[in-house]
């Protein structure tokens, strides 16, 4: 079995994590997709799945999790809002077709959430290896009064992207025009 290296992301309580998972449109346009956690590192726990029909754009909400599926863009976007320390762990985007084994779409995400300052956000990015298909990660710090998750990103903000040729970090005013909507 192929063991994928982890991508580690260090975030602060209250932030919103958005991961964009590209998939092979030829193979998986009509497949159910899911966001899973691996609490013990070995057995997956499915947190939210896309709904039929899989060939149309859709959005599914399940507690703090949102899946936005756009088959035409070959992209699955996952949002986790109001991150807590207890959300720390290993996550992955998969093609979900039980009782068969899930197909992992890219490196598992090692999420580390800590209690921290509400004003300062420093992303820690540890790119392990480079793939042709890589996640795009957007992390957002919302103030307690914020209630929506799809909106322009307030300061301070970091957009962390590692699309295969390196890592880009956009901070502060540079990120004002970035939106989490697809």
């Amino acid at each position: 079995a192929i063991v994928l290296e982890e991508e580690r992301y260090d975030l602060v309580e209250g932030q919103t994590l958005t991961v964009k998972c590209p998939f092979n449109i030829m193979k998986y346009a009509n497949s159910q997709k899911a966001w899973q956690r691996l609490p013990d590192g070995k057995e997956p726990l499915t947190l939210v799945v896309t709904q039929r029909p899989f060939t149309r754009p859709s959005e599914v909400h399940m507690g703090k999790f949102t899946l936005k599926h756009d088959p035409s863009e070959a992209m699955l976007q996952v949002q986790m809002t109001d991150l807590q320390v207890t959300d720390s762990g290993l996550y992955r985007c998969v093609i979900y077709h039980p009782p068969n084994d899930p197909v992992v779409l890219f490196h598992p995400v090692r999420l580390v959430v800590t209690k921290g300052s509400s004003d300062v956000f420093t992303p820690v990015i540890i790119p392990i290896t480079r793939l042709t298909e890589r996640p795009i990660l957007i992390t957002t710090k919302y103030s307690p009064s914020d209630t929506t998750t799809t909106r322009s990103l307030p300061k301070p903000t970091a957009v962390v992207s590692s699309p295969g040729l390196g890592v880009t970090i956009i901070n502060g005013t540079d990120a004002d025009s970035v939106s989490t909507s697809s």
């Epitope: 609490p39 057995e43 726990l45 507690g63 084994d101």
Partner: antibody
């Protein structure tokens, strides 16, 4: 479909070793987690240990010194060995598959009596 | 280890509702998923999954079985109870290793 079946001796002498086999069909033990539980007569279910899809094992601390779990991936079988048996090891022994943190399929169980 | 507490027995009349409780010594909720499951066991048989993740009905289980609860307090409801439901019912948590079972509740007919 998914099936698990335990096999082994029904009667074991005290101080001897019990060897049980869990034969699996309908899924691969290399990608699922197989657990062993036992149930003394009239009592509840006790976790003994489990073997993960990657072959690593976890054991109940109270049994760790006597219990060994192993597997044969070519035959899709999981093995349990517990030594130094005593009367309190008399129980029905079950293997079961864990799927998404619940046990969705169980073997029918094998009744083991420890007696001379 | 997480301890699960169940009342030992419950006597119920056929056609009535049976409510079985299970209390965990600490929360078994992870990522908004309640990792509490319910099993039915009849004498001489293996346990059978009824409810997973607190409220999801397992495949092939009649809809008269339902589950609810979160955190530390969980309930299995059988409504209406039928004669075939006479069995022991176990709750089981996977929120923390080792995974543990409650002592079981025996449902008996009045």
């Amino acid at each position: 479909q998914v099936q698990l079946k335990e096999s082994g001796p029904g009667l074991v002498q005290p101080s001897q070793t019990l060897s049980l086999t869990c034969t699996v069909s309908g899924f691969s033990i290399t990608s699922s987690n197989v657990y062993w539980f036992r149930q003394p007569p009239g009592k509840g279910l006790e976790w003994m240990g489990n073997i993960w899809g990657d072959g690593s094992t976890d054991y109940n601390s109270s049994l760790k010194s006597r219990l060994t779990l192993s597997r044969d991936t070519s035959k899709n079988q999981v093995f349990l060995k517990i030594n130094s048996l005593q009367s309190e090891d008399t129980a029905t022994y079950f293997c079961t598959r864990s799927w998404e943190y619940y046990f969705d399929h169980w073997g029918q169980g094998v009744v083991v009596t420890v007696s001379s | 280890d997480i301890v699960l507490t169940q009342s030992p027995a419950l006597a119920v009349s056929p056609g009535q509702r049976a409510t079985l409780s299970c209390r965990a010594s600490q929360s078994v909720t992870l990522s908004n998923v309640n990792l509490m499951n319910w099993y039915q066991q009849k004498p001489g048989q293996q346990p059978k999954l009824l409810i997973y993740h607190a409220s999801n009905l397992a495949s092939g289980i009649p809809t008269r079985f339902s589950g609810s609860g979160s955190g530390t307090d969980f309930t299995l409801t059988i409504d209406p109870v039928q004669a075939d439901d006479i069995a022991a019912y176990y709750c089981q948590q996977s929120g923390e290793s080792p995974r543990t079972f409650g002592g079981g509740t025996k449902v008996e007919l009045k």
